[in-house]
């Protein structure tokens, strides 16, 4: 999916008002310095691509974040403010229903959510030059 035509300011508002709090809740008990940020993004569409990938694609050691509250809110925000995104997800969900996974919070998941926090921070500051 191409995130170029999303309403970035509305997505940012949703992040600031609610998604960010859920990410903080998920990370509660973890030191902010515990993980190094290794994933970066260069502009808002790129940030959303990376955020979607890290949030919804299973990775080794972290089977699924998709059922977390921050993930559900992220996907809803993308569905509302990214034209055509909703239709792509309705189709994808049919396949996902067949692979139900037990919810386990692992250290790898915590690291992944830490990376997500960094991507969201970058998304919210699009005019900053890439380090």
């Amino acid at each position: 999916y191409d995130f170029t035509n999303c309403d970035f300011e509305k997505i940012k508002a949703a992040y600031l008002s609610t998604i960010s709090k859920d990410l903080i809740t998920y990370m509660s008990g973890t030191k902010s310095t515990e993980f190094n940020n290794t994933v970066s993004c260069s502009n808002r569409p790129h940030c959303l691509t990376e955020i979607q990938s890290l949030t919804f694609n299973p990775t080794a050691g972290c089977a699924s974040l998709a059922k977390e509250m921050f993930a559900m809110k992220t996907k809803a925000a993308l569905a509302i403010w990214c034209p055509g995104y909703s239709e792509t997800q309705i189709n994808a969900t049919q396949a996902m229903k067949k692979r139900r996974k037990r919810k386990v919070t692992t250290n790898k998941c915590l690291e992944q959510v830490s990376q997500l926090q960094g991507l969201w921070r970058r998304f919210n500051r699009p005019l900053l030059k890439q380090q």
């Epitope: 998709a66 059922k67 559900m72």
Partner: nanobody, 118 residues
Framework: EVQLVESGGGLVQPGGSLRLSCAAS????????MGWFRQAPGKERELVSA???????LYADSVKGRFTISADNSKNTAYLQMNSLKPEDTAVYYC????????????WGQGTLVTVSS
Amino acid sequence: EVQLVESGGGLVQPGGSLRLSCAASGNIFSRYIMGWFRQAPGKERELVSAIFSDGSTLYADSVKGRFTISADNSKNTAYLQMNSLKPEDTAVYYCAKGGYSSGWFDYWGQGTLVTVSS
């Protein structure tokens, strides 16, 4: 399995109001997303509003300030209060629920038609 049954659709004049209901039965889960989608003839299905189990809500720009989504967990029912209706709100409205198996919308209602016309 979850079943969703919508009600409350119908014909209303521009500027009027309707309240849609979506009753859920079956396997009810505590962490959820419930949403109202709509599909006008010849257009894609669009998410107009969503409510989460923590009470937070999201609205599409086209309905913000006119529509209000709510949920009564004791009745396993979600609502969409639609005020100041416009002809462009005419569509089939679907409620959907998710969060159990995929984190997205796993279960869908059959849809209820809302027609705004004088």
